[in-house]
């Protein structure tokens, strides 16, 4: 069950897609990887306040139990509900070969 | 690609599987489940550092990103990698019924 | 040795299908990637798609649908699946080892003699 | 999709001459491109990858140029077996992989 989505911390501050430059030497992959040199990582940022795009059930439970012992539980999370696929250009034993993967971009948010 | 499992800030600081007790009332359910009175609601908790229990390639480079941007992007976050069903007896407009949850119980932890 | 060969080339009907095959010898297609282009009689080279070493297709845009790169490891051939042929696929078929804008090590320059496919009735 | 666009589609040169054949890429492609070289009845010869690197066998006065969407390749002093047809190719990779040749720099005699 996907709840609300309207934020009432204000525009912008709730769980969502953002996108943060990075180069290979950022993400540690100038080693292994040879295009593209620049990413636009796509990734999920933002605050969880209660049943905002809660992805499940357990996100609807651990907002209660947060609101009870917020010591003890912590607010869900934004995380990625789906991915885009990106494809690398690699180094290989054998020489350089086409990879995708298709964990690497955020596609969509929720909050778990 | 799940990374390393060694924690190392220290015996069970990092992103684990915790049961916290609560019952019908804490969670809000009082008007509408039946059975059980109490759940031993199993969460993911802790904190996430460099490669810890990595999900996946999007986790890696969170966790890159975070070190490099950590006023801009957050560290990744424990969740749940999968669940246990959980059935509860729910009140229905026509009396009672047996209901199966999926996505109640965390069964297995990793940082995304 | 090192070797491309490519196979299954002739005359079809316009609508008809056509499968094209690149047997290769002296290295193991799970760890090269394989391209194949095309060129019309008198024309250019045109870029139809890759099969990665993993498995993975990619396709130019104008290929996607009609045409399906695969391959059996096992008998170190790649193929190309070409349906709904039309007339202006007419041309010359290459395999090639590798993704061509960076070499791989050893040779650098694996292409396949080609075949000659036309279409017409 | 990606569009690769050579220049100019046909240079007459001398013997002895410098050769500067262009390529432009519609996307930023880094250093995914190749020159290759076709004489008729002939499969394609690579003469450069990664945009500036000369493939094993080529003479060095073959040389390649440029990054992101504009490149070059030049002969510095074409010999009569460099006349022929040269072609760029990019690969562009990002949610997906899309190559494209350039439609090809025809070198003649002058």
């Known amino acids: 069950a996907r709840n609300g989505d309207h934020c009432p911390l204000g525009p912008g501050r709730c769980c969502r897609l953002h996108t943060v430059r990075a180069s290979l030497e950022d993400l540690g992959w100038a080693d292994w990887v040879l295009s593209p040199r620049e990413v636009q990582v796509t990734m999920c940022i933002g605050a969880c306040p209660s049943q905002f795009r809660a992805a499940n059930m357990h996100a609807q439970i651990k907002t209660s139990l947060h609101r009870l012992k917020p010591d003890t539980v912590p607010a869900p999370c934004c995380v990625p509900a789906s991915y885009n696929p990106m494809v690398l250009i690699q180094k290989t034993d054998t020489g350089v070969s086409l990879q995708t993967y298709d964990d690497l971009l955020a596609k969509d948010c929720h909050c778990i | 690609a799940r990374n390393g499992d060694h924690c190392p800030l220290g015996p069970g600081r990092c992103c684990r599987l915790h049961t916290v007790r609560a019952s019908l009332e804490d969670l809000g359910w009082a008007d509408w489940v039946l059975s059980p009175r109490e759940v031993q609601v199993t969460m993911c908790i802790g904190a996430c550092p460099s490669q810890f229990r990595a999900a996946n390639m999007h986790a890696q480079i969170k966790t890159s990103l975070h070190r490099l941007k950590p006023d801009t992007v957050p560290a990744p976050c424990c969740v749940p990698a999968s669940y246990n069903p959980m059935v509860l007896i729910q009140k229905t407009d026509t009396g009672v019924s047996l209901q199966t949850y999926d996505d109640l119980l965390a069964k297995d932890c990793h940082c995304i | 040795e090192v070797q491309l060969l490519e196979s299954g080339g002739g005359l079809v009907q316009p609508g008809g299908s056509l499968r094209l095959s690149c047997a290769v010898s002296?290295?193991?297609?799970?760890?090269?990637?394989m391209t194949w282009v095309r060129q019309a009689p008198g024309k250019g080279l045109e870029w139809i798609g890759i099969?990665?070493?993993?498995?993975?297709?990619y396709y130019a845009s104008w290929a996607k649908g009609r045409f399906t790169i695969s391959k059996d490891s096992s008998k170190n051939t790649v193929y190309l699946q070409m349906n709904s042929l039309r007339a202006e696929d007419t041309a010359v078929y290459f395999c090639?080892?590798?993704?061509?804008?960076?070499?791989?090590?050893?040779?650098?320059?694996?292409w396949g003699q080609g075949t000659l496919v036309t279409v017409s009735s | 999709d990606i569009v690769m666009t050579q220049s100019p589609a046909t240079l007459s040169v001398s013997p002895g001459e410098r050769a500067t054949l262009s390529c432009q890429a519609s996307?930023?492609?880094?250093?995914?491109l190749a020159w290759f070289q076709q004489k008729p009845g002939q499969p394609p010869r690579l003469l450069i990858y990664?945009?500036?690197t000369l493939a094993s066998g080529i003479p060095a006065r073959f040389s390649g140029s440029g990054s992101g969407t504009e490149f070059t390749l030049t002969i510095s002093s074409l010999q009569s077996e460099d006349f022929a047809v040269y072609y760029c190719?990019?690969?562009?990779?990002?949610?997906?992989?899309?190559?494209?040749f350039g439609q090809g720099t025809k070198v003649e005699i002058k």
């Open positions: 090639a080892r590798g993704i061509l804008v960076y070499a791989d090590y050893g040779d650098h320059n694996l």
């Open positions: 002296g290295f193991s297609l799970s760890s090269y990637d």
């Open positions: 099969i990665s070493g993993s498995g993975n297709t």
């Open positions: 996307e930023d492609i880094y250093t995914n």
């Open positions: 990664a945009a500036s």
């Open positions: 190719l990019g690969v562009y990779t990002y949610i997906s992989a899309e190559g494209a």
